[in-house]
Interface confidence: low
């Protein structure tokens, strides 16, 4: 079905009411490359039309380039030129008489999302029954509204909670922050997998993902490749890593011939036992004991260090 508009020239009413359903409101983005059309259509094609913006009062006239008026389209102008204004209207001069269109409220809408950050961003491990809390923060330009969408393995989770809120930014800041927090009170094995948060401003979407690992219960074990014999020559630096699997990360304690080792300037006893300059007296049996901080389960492993004198 085609629609025909009949224009009747009327010098007493040169502007005609817009047929647009967004009559009276113009939406703009503060983007130097975008133009906006104020739909003040004319019943006369060769009018001298200017655009008035307020406040403060400013007048824009067609420049034969990016600012123009067309009776069938309206007044076209780069968005950023009127982004300061609360309202605009078109004005025509006929025989020294001024005629004004209706007022159009200017609504500045942003769309650009700078980034979406998940926290924690990686290495998330839990055991069954623990609480998972994932924060998704979107940073955007001003005047943006954000919709968050989460995708995760067990979307029908009964104990899931989603909270979205705007974050306060410093006054004068050129950006907005939005936060969506996903909480699952008691995770199960089916909650293991990829968690994706997508932030959408309508015209732009950005997303980020992280992997969540869920263990049946807290545990600790030595990983493959844990050495039982280390050989070194006097003066070398010796590194003996405690290769483990476990959740949560275990407490690690090193012993030499049954005596606890403490870190000092010659030896570092962390998840890697480091002897800065090995000597003959460092020869012996080193025991590493892993303790799970929740279950208190312990695992031990003995490494024999042999030091050769050249």
């Amino acid at each position: 079905a085609s629609v025909i508009y009949v224009y009747v020239q009327d010098y007493r009413s040169p502007f005609i009411a817009s047929v647009s359903d967004q009559h009276g409101v113009v939406y703009i983005t503060e983007n130097k490359n975008k133009t906006v059309v104020i739909p003040c259509l004319g019943s006369i094609s060769n009018l001298n039309v200017s655009l008035c913006a307020r406040y403060p009062e400013k007048r824009f006239v067609p420049d034969g380039n990016r600012i123009s008026w067309d009776s069938k389209k309206g007044f076209t102008i780069p968005s950023y030129m009127i982004s300061y204004a609360g309202m605009v209207f078109c004005e025509a001069k006929i025989n020294d008489e001024s005629y004004q269109s209706i007022m159009y409220i200017v609504v500045v809408v942003g769309y650009r999302i700078y980034d979406v950050v998940l926290s924690p961003s990686h290495g998330i491990e839990l055991s069954v029954g623990e609480k998972l809390v994932l924060n998704c923060t979107a940073r955007t330009e001003l005047n943006v509204g954000i919709d968050f969408n989460w995708e995760y393995p067990s979307s029908k989770h009964q104990h899931k909670k989603l909270v979205n809120r705007d974050l306060k930014t410093q006054s004068g800041s050129e950006m907005k922050k939005f936060l969506s927090t996903l909480t699952i009170d008691g995770v199960t094995r089916s909650d293991q997998g990829l968690y994706t948060c997508a932030a959408s401003s309508g015209l732009m979407t950005k997303k980020n993902s992280t992997f969540v690992r869920v263990h049946e219960k807290p545990f600790v074990a030595f990983g493959s490749g844990m050495e039982s014999l280390v050989e070194a020559t006097v003066g070398e630096r010796v590194r003996i890593p405690a290769k483990y699997l476990g959740y949560p990360p275990p407490e690690i304690k090193w012993y030499k011939n049954g005596i606890p080792l403490e870190s000092n300037h010659t030896i570092k006893a962390g998840h890697v036992l480091t002897i800065m300059e090995v000597s003959e007296r460092d020869t012996g049996n080193y025991t590493v004991i892993l303790t799970n901080p929740i279950s208190k389960e312990k695992q031990s492993h003995v490494v024999s260090l042999v030091v050769y004198v050249p």
């Epitope: 939406y27 490359n33 809408v109 959408s200 309508g202 015209l203 732009m204 950005k206």
Partner: antibody, heavy 117, light 107 residues
């Protein structure tokens, strides 16, 4: 299974009209911006129109403004493209695509529109 | 409108080769760029968004880089199933525009 299926394509004379539909399934249709993208035979991709999740914002490429209308019915998980005053240069496969303007992450298989006398 | 210039328009490579496609924007588009793969008779498929982020489920041999006006898409080791046309797309400013495409063939 996330799926988009277009329908409504066909042969039409220049100046004629067609209404394309896209049926969505497997995701929350009402949460996503939806788009139409077209591809003329043997040519590249061209974005046609976008409509935001609640139909608050609608965007068109210049060549179809005033002739094409994008709309959606979230209750039926459906996207539409009403095409009027069709021209020979509108001949193309029309794809329905999910996602915002940032990235079209799910595409339908397309429906062919041929404008010829 | 922002013009996206893709090069080359076609290229022939052998299985196992490293393949690089470039995309140049007529204006600064920050990192607002996507890459798509379209196999003959199929719909396009999103591979990379935000210039360098791999879409979920896409093999790690595909990668993207660049910002501003110059962008690169790389296949580290070409596989027979990678035969397709590849498109870049900017989403910095409306209208959204695609590159002309790069048709990739096996030698």
């Amino acid at each position: 299974q996330v799926n988009l299926r277009e329908s409504g394509g066909g042969l039409v004379k220049p100046g004629g009209s067609l209404r394309l539909s896209c049926a969505a399934s497997g995701f929350t249709f009402g949460s996503y911006t939806m788009n139409w993208v077209r591809q003329a035979p043997g040519k590249g991709l061209e974005w046609v129109a976008s409509i935001t999740s609640g139909s608050s914002y609608i965007f068109y490429t210049d060549s179809v403004k005033g002739r094409f209308t994008i709309s959606r019915d979230n209750s039926r998980s459906s996207l539409f493209l009403q095409m009027n005053s069709l021209r020979a240069e509108d001949t193309a496969i029309y794809y329905c695509a999910r996602g915002s303007a940032s990235a079209f992450d799910i595409w339908g298989q397309g429906t062919m529109v041929t404008v010829s006398s | 409108d922002i013009q996206m210039t893709q090069s080359p328009s076609s290229l022939s490579a052998s299985v196992g080769d490293r393949v690089t496609i470039t995309c140049k924007a007529s204006d600064d588009i920050i990192n607002y760029l996507n890459w798509y793969q379209q196999k003959p008779g199929e719909a396009p498929k999103l591979l990379i968004y935000d210039a360098s982020i791999l879409e979920t489920g896409v093999p790690s041999r595909f990668s993207g880089s660049g910002s501003g006006t110059d962008f690169t898409f790389t296949i580290s080791s070409l596989q027979p199933e990678d035969i397709a046309t590849y498109y870049c797309q900017q989403y910095d400013i409306l209208p959204l525009t695609f590159g002309g495409g790069t048709k990739l063939e096996i030698k």
